[in-house]
Interface confidence: low
Amino acid sequence: FEIALPRESNITVLIKLGTPTLLAKPCYIVISKRHTTMLSIKPGERILFTFSCQSPENHFVIEIQKNIDCMSGPCPFGEVQLQPSTSLLPTLNRTFIWDVKAHKSIGLELQFSIPRLRQFGPGESCPDGVTYSISGRIDATVVRIGTFCSNGTVSRIKMQEGVKMALHLPWFHPRNVSGFSIANRSSIKRLCIIESVFEGEGSATLMSANYPEGFPEDELMTWQFVIPAHLRASVSFLNFNLSNCERKEERVEYYIPGSTTNPEVFKLEDKQPGNMAGNFNLSLQGCDQDAQNPGILRLQFQVLVQHPQNESNKIYVVDLSNERATSLTIEPRPVKQSRKFVPGCFVCLESRTCSTNLTLTSGSKHKISFLCDNLTRLWMNVEKNISCTDHRYCQRKSYSLQVPSDIFHLPVELHDFSWKLLVPKDRLSLVLVPAQKLQQHTHEKPCNTSFSYLVASAIPSQDLYFGSFCPGGSIEQIQVKQNISVTLRTFAPSFRQEASRQGLTVSFIPYFKEEGVFTVTPDTKSKVYLRTPNWDRGLPSLTSVSWNISVPRDQVACLTFFKERTGVVCQTGRAFMIIQEQRTRAEEIFSLDEDALPKPRFHHHSFWVNISNCSPASGKQLDLLFWVTLTPRTVDLT
């Protein structure tokens, strides 16, 4: 083996005999034929050595200590490395020790990476043998903060004046990272702060400093608990002792956000608070002890985090402070009223003002809770306006139409999320580009996704519904002439899982005169069904829509109309359809109120289908359904 320590490393390595075992044969460290039972390597030294036995891990342990001086110069903050790397060390039980000395005014924070730490008490050990021992300092006195295993909730420990951190790794453990970093903080004005983060349900057992011995006299120690919003925390004291106080009183103080009586002070013998919503702090405050008969203050307690027993205790924060022109309404789903008694279902603002429905507006954070036996009785509708007032500023600007993640945190199903897209009249138009190509919902090929986009005109005088579209089709973009509303409507709770498939980008583009243009790139595997807007009610009077249909170079598109005739009867004007080859610009014009629709026809190149309506007689509307299929091109007919 070779261990080389850089001169400036402030690292010392010590190999020494471990706990004596009743092994018959002794073992030695061999350095240049000389046998020894202890080896110390200091900065700047490079030592070559071997062991005289096959299993040195049964005899020796190795300690690697790094002294970090924050008194005389800058402190090397950041992720703490295992130096030397474990791969360069002999396979012995090893303890890495970091001894950090700092001014009283400087706070030091140990940050532990996931899986975080779990404190254990006397007589316990860690399943994998990896342990952390953490100590602090009060003047010259060392104070044990605790010993910890992996897989817990302790994410950070803040101290001041100094930290001694020991990481014990068994010889067989492959670990090559320390799992923590050091950061500097302002003075914490107490012995230490331990942060415990819960990701979900679970419990943590924690102990006062020096446990099971006595907590330092007149000291203050704080635990900060980070609890997910939907869970509740309860504290119970497993074991405690009180010292004999001369002045002041030993107590625990809770800082509970939202409480009007912070800090809430409890005696150790009191019943401790339970069912707490949100993050909270717990502090242990010692007293001035009787010099003759001090006794000891010690505390071992458990924090249990679990789902609340009923929904009414949960507080949800809906942060609309960064949203503009947005309103969120939580309201009852429409259901058939039964004659039976139905318990009330209310949504509450700030836990106090409760009603059957609630509208939250953008610009602020809202705290809400529910008093409801079954939250599936409610749903949520959101409206957001995206408007452009200055066409010079908006042109080519894009917005992402996505449901904000905050909304998924609420326990109520999203029904509709509507974006109203408003443009200056006759100045700009809109284009919708989906993250995944869209399919138009038709009777022949219905959407079977957990959500769809409903696209409709948002001009009050205009009754124009472009259709319902879901991911997984062939429509690459939808261009619309003027104001529209795009509504993401959910149909199943699985929308939360499928939410990653949502995503539309809207861009403001130069104004064009057609009511809508659909850009379609058919899939070689399936029929693309397309139908005119306002299906079943008829395309509005004098409205023109187009489909830009791309045909891949090696394919032939077959365009088929559902009926022989449209059935439209024009009161004034003419209804016509133009089919135009994009490459040659050759076009055919069909009179929809007179001619039969064309028979299935083949297109070797991309083409346009444009439909323009007349003013139809009532009841004789223009509705057109067609489909496009692709087949491989066998003979090039061009």
Epitope: R396, S398, V433, A435, Q436, Q477, S500, R501, T505, S507
Partner: antibody, heavy 120, light 112 residues
Amino acid sequence: EVQLVESGGGLVQPGGSLRLSCAASGFTFSSYWMSWVRQAPGKGLEWVANIKQDGSEKDYVDSVKGRFTISRDNAKNSLYLQMNSLRVEDTAVYYCAREGGSSGWTFDYWGQGTLVTVSS
Amino acid sequence: DIVMTQSPLSLPVTPGEPASISCRSSQSLLHSSGHNFLDWYLQKPGQSPQLLIYLGSNRASGVPDRFSGSGSGTDFTLKISRVEAEDVGVYYCMQALQTPPTFGQGTKLEIK
């Protein structure tokens, strides 16, 4: 048909500058993030920089930060890479790539590349 | 940055035989969405790279079904069920989870 065509490569001395261009066609350019990826002669691929649809967000590999600038002109369907303070180790074929697909970073279309040689 | 490691670096294969390339990442590429953010690219001689597989196991359009991707977390495999002469080139894996995206060193597939 999606097409990306790079240009602007050539021989330049260390410390010099070049501006690469990428002309895009066959897709809605303004709807996609775009990237530059390079490949040193006989070596593997290294991502260099990318830019959001509207140009509001840009990111660079550490080795080119402060020296290279990515930009785009959606009206011209063009992507650019301004390379200053060039070093010998910047010698590579530079590819313009479209970031498509649900994983964001997936480069679903690539240009044919343009060779940049930095040599004295 | 996430480090990607491919093996083997060179892979001579007889046409019609299967081939397998391994890729390991220095940290898990499994996203909360359940996808593995790993792509495979092929760079044929004298050509630019082309996307073969995205999100670990999804074939890009136009990619023959003899190509398949598998694996999860940190270990991934690209398999070619029956190698054809046109499959020669350098295969790269790339993590698409974090910026910057990082590529493996490449595996050169050649015909025996």
